[in-house]
């Protein structure tokens, strides 16, 4: 009945909502169905949130921070609905509300606790610092705090450095992991336990691959099924780093199955994208297409990074002319 | 059963003060606005003031605003009528009523048996 | 303030008639009008509420009736015992306001 939030029962007359920031929620109440009906939502019993009597609304009095954010579902009173549908709610609405409901029969009152949660889709980053190389996950707002694990060829890393900065309404968060010299596979996991939401990021680095000059190379990518629901929408991005920057080879969009191509020389297999296969080819290698190249693909769950080192090397022709 | 029962009627000069009191018993008082409503001796009825259920709002008639001062203890079970400036129109019996529910649909649904006021020189 | 004007001021009737008192708002009140009776020396008693609910425990030979400006109260068969003032109030905006009253007497 009420699909913008989901709630917990909980004993007397008491529930608890869970929103997320900057969506809308319902805060359920219910009551015998009788006339006369009045409506009062408070918030922490101080705050006038909404008020209905005598059939309309009676905001005159409504604290100024739900102005234009609150509703009630009007053709439904008379069927015993006293819920409020509240917009865009913030971490500030987070409490308890009072709803109380009198008819010519009865007075009741019924309390909800709101809870809010934030979870912007968090990412993971590959990064070179002079002769470092990091995997940094990272969450640009989340609350309340997150649970951030680490495991490297799936067993948990103890070694978890959080940099933490609180903002009003939620924290930013990075969790920056020291891979250098590393061929292990490496998982991060963030996990929003209120939202009862949980983002895993993995990283895998394949052999390296020595080609020649004018050559062509194949580089593979492929989802892990544990993580990959094709249902769902994704966004696959080959780069290749050039003096510490990657730049954006091309990308797919699972939404509009478009494919946008930066390089001429870069091909993607139609075929096999449509089973779930974002293997790349580079035609005609040249000697700057040494280095690191990055397939990422990334949903709102998940983000899997595949690294590949390539070092091209001169043909003989090539070499004999030097 | 809903019983209020008010007090602290009596004789009083003009221009001095009064305090009425009204105690409930029977219902949840703390779910119920509660109104004052006066009738002058041989005269019609006239609502004075009201109080809602949680004290969050009160309302009062023209002829006392800036007089009066309506006032609930919800953990006592009572509700004031602070009078002052008093004037000898204000002399009535003086109602305590409970409203249908908050306070905020304005109708009287339950009546104490009243007390007299008279303000007289 | 809203006025409500009642008539008629007194009336006489016997026992068994219809009775209709009307209550006259100065501006549109919607339904929002309440009907008490009083007895002398007792409180005031409320017998219907939004122009035409009849109160819990209030007889039915009592009926309310109108909206917006114009309204009635009614009762069907008059007995001894409905001898009262009878007062209409609106509750549509503060200040609630009374009607002046229609005494009722038995013939």
């Known amino acids: 009945i009420f699909p913008l939030a989901f709630f917990i029962y909980v004993p007397m007359n008491e529930q608890i909502v869970i929103g997320r920031l900057d969506e809308d929620i319902i805060l359920p109440s219910s009551f015998e169905r009788g006339s006369e009906v009045v409506i009062h939502w408070k918030y922490q019993d101080s705050y006038k949130v909404h008020s209905y009597y005598k059939g309309s609304d009676h905001l005159e009095s409504q604290d100024p921070r739900y102005a234009n954010r609150t509703s009630l579902f009007y053709n439904e009173i008379q069927n015993g609905n006293a819920s409020l549908f509240f917009r865009r709610v913030s971490l500030l609405d987070e409490g308890i509300y009072t709803c109380y409901v009198g008819t010519a029969i009865q007075v009741i009152t019924n309390k909800v606790v709101l809870k809010v949660g934030v979870f912007l889709t968090p990412v993971m980053k590959y990064e070179k610092r002079n002769t470092n190389s990091f995997l940094i996950c990272s969450v640009l707002s989340v609350y309340p705090r997150p649970i951030i694990t680490w495991k490297m060829d799936n067993t948990p890393i103890s070694e978890n450095n959080m940099e933490e900065t609180g903002s009003l309404d939620s924290f930013s968060i990075n969790s920056p992991l020291n891979i250098t010299g590393s061929n292990s596979s490496y998982e991060c996991t963030i996990e929003n336990s209120l939202l009862k939401q949980t983002w895993t990021g993995r990283w895998t680095m394949k052999d390296g691959l020595h080609k020649m000059q004018s050559e062509h190379v194949s580089l593979s990518c492929q989802p892990v099924n544990d993580y990959f629901s094709p249902n769902q929408d994704f966004k696959v991005t080959w780069s290749r780093m050039k003096s510490g920057t990657f730049s954006v080879l091309a990308y797919y969009l699972s939404s509009s199955q478009n494919t946008i191509i930066n390089e001429s020389r870069f091909s993607w297999n139609k075929e096999l994208i449509n089973q779930s296969d974002f293997s790349m080819n580079l035609m005609d290698l040249n000697l700057s297409d040494s280095g690191e190249y990055l397939c990422n693909i990334s949903s709102d769950e998940y983000t899997l990074l595949t690294i590949h080192t390539v070092h091209v090397e001169p043909s003989q022709e090539t070499a004999s002319h030097n | 059963q809903v019983q209020l029962v008010e007090s602290g009627g009596g004789v009083v000069q003009p221009g001095r003060s009064l305090r009425l009191s009204c105690a409930a018993s029977?219902?949840?008082?703390?779910?119920?606005?509660i109104h004052w409503v006066r009738q002058a001796p041989g005269k019609g009825l006239e609502w004075v003031a009201v109080?809602?259920?949680?004290?969050?709002?009160?309302y009062y008639a023209d002829s006392v605003r800036g007089r009066f001062t309506i006032s609930r203890d919800n953990s006592k079970n009572t509700l004031s009528l602070q009078m002052n400036s008093l004037r000898v129109e204000d002399t009535a019996v003086y109602y305590c009523?409970?409203?249908?529910?908050?306070?905020?649909?304005?109708?009287?649904?339950?009546w104490g048996q009243g007390t007299l006021v008279t303000v007289s020189s | 303030d809203i006025q409500m004007t009642q008539s008629p001021s007194t009336l006489s009737a016997s026992v068994g008639d219809r009775v209709t008192i009307t209550c006259r708002a100065s501006?549109?009140?919607?339904?929002?009008l309440a009907w008490y009776q009083q007895k002398p020396g007792k409180a005031p008693k409320l017998l219907i509420y939004?122009?035409?609910s009849l109160e819990s425990g209030v007889p039915s030979r009592f009926s309310g009736s109108g909206s917006g400006t114009e309204f009635t109260l009614t009762i069907s068969s008059l007995q001894p015992d409905d001898l009262a003032t009878y007062y209409c109030?609106?509750?549509?905006?503060?200040?609630?306001?009374f009607g002046q009253g229609t005494k009722l007497e038995i013939k």
């Open positions: 501006q549109s009140i919607s339904s929002w």
């Open positions: 939004k122009a035409s």
């Open positions: 109080i809602w259920y949680d004290g969050s709002d009160k």
């Open positions: 009523a409970r409203d249908r529910s908050s306070g905020a649909m304005g109708y009287f649904v339950y």
């Open positions: 109030q609106q509750y549509n905006a503060y200040s609630y306001t």
């Open positions: 029977g219902f949840t008082f703390s779910d119920y606005g």
